[in-house]
C-alpha cells in the first residue's frame, strides 16, 4: 500500500489530475508490498488506449505485473521495481501521469524516515569519499513542471573533506550556462536551478572527490512543458449539411485544449434585418454553453425536427485563457423533393466539406 502522508505523495506532472497538484508523484513502498499506481483520465473524460512505461521501456504484463488502462499493479515489489513509471496515451505518447517509485528494504510504515544527513563517525582517520545516505541516492529521474525549482543533492563525507563539482551532460556546469544562473551550496552538497525551462533538460552529475578517491552520481532532469495554446478545433464531417424538413441533424466538433476551455454552440441570426451589429460584430444566439473539464472533448449539437428557420450558419466556439477558436457549420433545410435533388447534385460534384 502507498503511504498516505503528504511527505510521501507529493504530486504529479503538471498535465495530470492527481491526488496532489501539478507535479510528479513520488511514492515509497516497502519490500514485498503491492505497488499500485492509478492514473484516472484527465477531467474524468474518456481515456483512450494507454501504455505503462518504466524507465523509458514499455511494461510487459505478467503474473506479477498487472496492467490496466488506468491502473498498474506490481505484486511482491522488490528493489528492482524502483524507478520512473509513466502512463502515456498510446497514440500520442503524451505523458498522462508520472510516478517516481522507490522500494525500500524495510516494509512500509507511516513514519517519516527523515533524519540527519550526516553519517555516524566511523572513526576512520583517512578515507575516500562516500555517500552519507546511500539509500537516498537511488532515485535518478526527476520530472518537473516548467517554472518550478529543482535541487540536486549529493551529501557525502570523507577525510579529508571532499570537494564537489557539477557536470551537465558530461561537461563542467557553471552559472553562466543557464539563464537565471545556478545556486550552489557546497556545505549542503547541493545544486539549485530556479524556474526551470525545457533547455534545462539533461543529465546532471555530481563529482565528489578527495585525494583518496572520487564518486559520482548522475541524475536525469526532464522538464514537463505545457505549451499553452488556444483551443484546437476539428470539425466532424460533414461540416455542411442539407436536411429534410422535420428530420434530425447533428453537428460534431472536437475540441483540444490543455487549459480548461469554455465551449459554445452559436447560431448566426438577423436582428431587424441585419446580420451584424453597429460595430460589425455578427449577431449570434447562444444555443449551448459550458466549461469542459477534459483535455479532449467531442461536442455535439443536435437539432431535432428541423424547420426552415433552423437553416443557416452555426459556430462551434472554444475559448481558453490564451485565445479563441471557431469552426463554422452550414445547414440547409428543404422540403423532401428539393432536398433529394440537392443530394444528387452534391453526389455528382463530390461532397464539399469545411476545413
Amino acid at each position: 500500500e502507498s503511504l498516505g502522508t503528504e511527505q510521501r505523495v507529493v504530486g504529479r506532472a503538471a498535465e495530470v489530475p492527481g491526488p496532489e497538484p501539478g507535479q510528479q508523484e513520488q511514492l515509497v513502498f516497502g519490500s514485498g508490498d503491492a505497488v499500485e499506481l492509478s492514473c484516472p483520465p484527465p477531467g474524468g473524460g474518456p481515456m483512450g488506449p494507454t501504455v505503462w512505461v518504466k524507465d523509458g521501456t514499455g511494461l510487459v504484463p505478467s503474473e506479477r505485473v498487472l496492467v490496466g488502462p488506468q491502473r498498474l499493479q506490481v505484486l511482491n515489489a522488490s528493489h528492482e521495481d524502483s524507478g520512473a513509471y509513466s502512463c502515456r496515451q498510446r497514440l500520442t505518447q503524451r505523458v498522462l501521469c508520472h510516478f517516481s517509485v522507490r522500494v525500500t528494504d524495510a516494509p512500509s510504515s507511516g513514519d517519516d524516515e527523515d533524519g540527519e544527513d550526516e553519517a555516524e563517525d566511523t572513526g576512520v582517520d583517512t578515507g575516500a569519499p562516500y555517500w552519507t545516505r546511500p539509500e537516498r541516492m537511488d532515485k535518478k529521474l526527476l520530472a518537473v513542471p516548467a517554472a518550478n525549482t529543482v535541487r540536486f543533492r549529493c551529501p557525502a563525507a570523507g577525510n579529508p573533506t571532499p570537494s564537489i563539482s557539477w557536470l551537465k551532460n558530461g561537461r563542467e556546469f557553471r552559472g553562466e550556462h543557464r539563464i537565471g544562473g545556478i545556486k550552489l551550496r557546497h556545505q549542503q552538497w547541493s545544486l539549485v536551478m530556479e524556474s526551470v525551462v525545457p533547455s534545462d533538460r539533461g543529465n546532471y552529475t555530481c563529482v565528489v572527490e578527495n585525494k583518496f578517491g572520487s564518486i559520482r552520481q548522475t541524475y536525469t532532469l526532464d522538464v514537463l512543458e505545457r505549451s499553452p495554446h488556444r483551443p484546437i478545433l476539428q470539425a466532424g464531417l460533414p461540416a455542411n449539411q442539407t436536411a429534410v424538413l422535420g428530420s434530425d441533424v447533428e453537428f460534431h466538433c472536437k475540441v483540444y485544449s490543455d487549459a480548461q476551455p469554455h465551449i459554445q454552440w452559436l447560431k448566426h441570426v438577423e436582428v431587424n434585418g441585419s446580420k451584424v451589429g453597429p460595430d460589425g460584430t455578427p449577431y449570434v444566439t447562444v444555443l449551448k454553453s459550458w466549461i469542459s473539464e477534459s483535455v479532449e472533448a467531442d461536442v455535439r449539437l443536435r437539432l431535432a425536427n428541423v424547420s426552415e428557420r433552423d437553416g443557416g450558419e452555426y459556430l462551434c466556439r472554444a475559448t481558453n485563457f490564451i485565445g479563441v477558436a471557431e469552426k463554422a457549420f452550414w445547414l440547409s433545410v428543404h422540403g423532401p423533393r428539393a432536398a433529394e435533388e440537392e443530394l444528387v447534385e452534391a453526389d455528382e460534384a463530390g461532397s464539399v466539406y469545411a476545413g
Epitope: Q7, R8, E20, P21, G22, L142, V144, A147, R226, D258
Partner: antibody, heavy 127, light 107 residues
Framework: EVQLVESGGGLVQPGGSLRLSCAAS????????ISWVRQAPGKGLEWVGR????????NYADSVKGRFTISADTSKNTAYLQMNSLRAEDTAVYYC????????????????????WGQGTLVTVSS | DIQMTQSPSSLSASVGDRVTITCRAS??????LAWYKQKPGKAPKLLIY???FLYSGVPSRFSGSGSGTDFTLTISSLQPEDFATYYC?????????FGQGTKVEIK
C-alpha cells in the same frame, strides 16, 4: 509583471458563505500553484490551502477542511476560495499567493514556496 | 502539525545594526524553511527559501542558515525599510505552518 489581485471580501453573518477571487497575470497560470493564506487582525499568518490549477488538485488546512473549497478557472487565470459555514474565527485578511515547488529526489516531499502575494481582501464574520 | 517557534517575539534595533532572528521547529524539517517579511497593511514578501537560498531581488544583507530544527535569519546591516515583522514557515509536513512572527522595531 506578476500580479495577483484578490476580491470578494466583505461582511458576512456566521453560517453564511462568501466566494473570494484571485485574478492572476504575468505568469503561466498552469505551471505553478495558488495558495490561500489568512491573517486574523493583529495575528500571524495561517496557511489555508493550495490548488494547482491545471489538475484542480487541492490541499487544505484541517481548520477549514469540509467548509472551504479552492477551485480555479484556467480560462480566466483566476483561482477561487469558496467559504461556507463561516465562523467568527474565520475573520481575517485573505491573501492568495503564487506557489511553486522545489523538487528534490533526496527527500520524500516537495517544498512549497509562495513567492508573489496579492494585496489581500478582508473577510469579516459577524452578526 | 509541526510547530514553529520564533524568538524573540519582538526586538528594537538601530539602522546599521546586525539583527538575528531564530526559528525552531518541533520536528526535523530538513532545510524546508522559508522566511517572509511583512510591513503593516501589506502582503508578506519572500526573502529566503530552503533555509539559506536568497530569493531573486532580495538584498544580500539578508541571509539564512540552519537545517533540521534550528534556523536563523540574519540582517547584516539593518536599513530603514527593514523595520517589519518576519515570519518563518516550514513545508515538509502537512499543513505548512508559520512561526508566530518577530517584530523588528526602531530603537
Amino acid at each position: 509583471e506578476v500580479q495577483l489581485v484578490e476580491s470578494g471580501g466583505g461582511l458576512v453573518q456566521p453560517g453564511g458563505s462568501l466566494r473570494l477571487s484571485c485574478a492572476a497575470s504575468g505568469f503561466t497560470f498552469t505551471s505553478t500553484g495558488i495558495s490561500w493564506v489568512r491573517q486574523a487582525p493583529g495575528k500571524g499568518l495561517e496557511w489555508v490551502g493550495r490548488i494547482y490549477p491545471t489538475s484542480g488538485s487541492t490541499n487544505y488546512a484541517d481548520s477549514v477542511k469540509g467548509r472551504f473549497t479552492i477551485s480555479a478557472d484556467t480560462s480566466k487565470n483566476t483561482a477561487y476560495l469558496q467559504m461556507n459555514s463561516l465562523r467568527a474565527e474565520d475573520t481575517a485578511v485573505y491573501y492568495c499567493a503564487r506557489t511553486y515547488g522545489i523538487y528534490d529526489l533526496y527527500v520524500d516531499y516537495t517544498e512549497y514556496v509562495m513567492d508573489y502575494w496579492g494585496q489581500g481582501t478582508l473577510v469579516t464574520v459577524s452578526s | 502539525d509541526i510547530q514553529m517557534t520564533q524568538s524573540p517575539s519582538s526586538l528594537s534595533a538601530s539602522v546599521g545594526d546586525r539583527v538575528t532572528i531564530t526559528c525552531r521547529a518541533s520536528q526535523d524539517v530538513d532545510t524546508s524553511l522559508a522566511w517572509y517579511k511583512q510591513k503593516p497593511g501589506k502582503a508578506p514578501k519572500l526573502l529566503i527559501y530552503s533555509a539559506s537560498f536568497l530569493y531573486s531581488g532580495v538584498p544580500s544583507r539578508f541571509s539564512g542558515s540552519g537545517s533540521g530544527t534550528d534556523f536563523t535569519l540574519t540582517i547584516s546591516s539593518l536599513q530603514p525599510e527593514d523595520f517589519a515583522t518576519y515570519y518563518c514557515q516550514q513545508s515538509t509536513g502537512h499543513p505548512q505552518t508559520f512561526g508566530q512572527g518577530t517584530k523588528v522595531e526602531i530603537k
